[in-house]
């Protein structure tokens, strides 16, 4: 399908935006309010969205002050950007079992940005490992 | 597609005022961050005034030349940006364009409306 | 405020050859390896459209004869073969912070 793998590449480029805009967050932590975030770690499988738009929902915040403002209000603003939907993603919003995103661990903004990047990668990496095994799931 | 019209142009006198507005359509507009730019006649373009989207708490902010006496707001469930304008001057003649901020760039623009100031 | 310098402020450019349009800001608008600076075209009688964002990113749907490029305060805007309808108004712009400036705009003519 021409379609279908054009939508997986949008996918793919739209996860490294992702991870160089988290990058670029992570240079304005002190520009950040020090407010503690459910970042998810050790996501399980097939609970990679539901982390995804846990850290997508979080309400992470530019502390409002200097020369920096619009730059990280932008880059936050990109961050909950929808990225185009997978097979996987459309079978994992159906799933119910798991973690609410209130029960996972609260961590500051530069942990909270590290375990975003960290999630962003294993998603990357499922994609990349599951179209080189010829499907078309994730 | 995306569009954007601006209406409440006119003739005014030094002094008076004007609400301008901003009709929006074909994209997500309670999301977006929406800018007024302003152009006067044979000259350059000038940003006036943002509000930011409803995820932001709607927060505002404007030029030095338009402060105290311009304010900007939106009604996201109208889909429509406003741009309220007292104690005009006549340096504040110009076409005003409603813009859309979309990360990085006003991407799209209406084509703007008439706001001239004389006596 | 962050004050860009446009030059030439005017052109005049036979079909078919190239183009180069400068733009100075008086203070850095680039960190951390972006550049907050973009270039729009104003068309006679038209609103502005956006040619190149972020410094060098062509805007979906602008022909690839617009680059750009630069860091830092110098930032150039290039037209590699110029075409009849890409006479107008260039106008640089930065979003570094705020307020939000542009630059006087540079007047591109046809010979």
């Known amino acids: 399908h021409k379609s279908s793998s054009q939508g997986q590449d949008r996918h793919m480029i739209r996860m490294r935006q992702l991870i160089d805009i988290v990058d670029q967050l992570k240079n304005y932590v002190n520009d950040l309010v020090p407010e503690f975030l459910p970042a998810p770690e050790d996501v399980e499988t097939n609970c990679e969205w539901s982390a995804f738009s846990c850290f997508q929902k979080a309400q992470l915040k530019s502390a409002n002050t200097g020369n920096n403002e619009r730059i990280i209000n932008v880059s936050i603003k990109k961050l909950k950007r929808k990225p185009p939907s997978t097979n996987a993603g459309r079978r994992q919003k159906h799933r119910l079992t798991c973690p609410s995103c209130d029960s996972y661990e609260k961590k500051p903004p530069k942990e909270f940005l590290e375990r975003f990047k960290s999630l962003l990668q294993k998603m990357i990496h499922q994609h990349l490992s599951s179209r080189t095994h010829g499907s078309e799931d994730s | 597609e995306v569009q954007l019209v601006e209406s409440g142009g006119g003739l005014v006198q030094p002094g008076g005022s004007l609400r301008l507005s901003c009709a929006a359509s074909?994209?997500?507009?309670?999301?977006?961050?929406m800018d007024w730019v302003r152009q006067a006649p044979g000259k350059g373009l000038e940003w006036v005034a943002e509000?930011?989207?409803?995820?932001?708490?709607?927060?505002?902010y404007y030029a030095e030349s338009v402060k105290g006496r311009f304010t900007i707001s939106r009604d996201d469930s109208k889909n429509s940006l406003y741009l309220q304008m007292n104690s005009l001057k006549t340096e504040d003649t110009a076409v005003y364009y409603c813009?859309?901020?979309?990360?990085?760039?006003?991407?799209?623009w209406g084509q703007g409306t008439l706001v001239t100031v004389s006596s | 405020d962050i004050v860009m310098t446009q030059t030439p402020l005017s052109l005049s450019v036979t079909p078919g050859q190239p183009a180069s349009i400068s733009c100075r800001a008086s203070?850095?608008?680039?960190?951390?390896?972006?550049?907050?600076m973009h270039w729009y075209l104003q068309k006679p009688g038209q609103p502005p459209q956006l040619l190149i964002y972020?410094?060098?990113n062509l805007e979906s749907g602008v022909p690839d004869r617009f680059s750009g490029s630069g860091s830092g305060t110098d930032f150039t805007l290039k037209i590699s073969r110029v075409e009849a309808e890409d006479v107008g108004v260039y106008y640089c712009?930065?979003?570094?912070?705020?307020?939000?400036?542009f630059g006087q705009g540079t007047k591109l003519e046809i010979k």
């Open positions: 813009t859309e901020y979309d990360y990085e760039g006003f991407v799209h």
């Open positions: 074909g994209f997500t507009f309670s999301d977006a961050w």
């Open positions: 509000i930011r989207s409803e995820a932001d708490n709607h927060p505002t």
């Open positions: 203070k850095s608008v680039s960190t951390y390896g972006y550049s907050y």
């Open positions: 972020l410094a060098s």
């Open positions: 712009q930065h979003s570094r912070e705020l307020p939000l400036t």
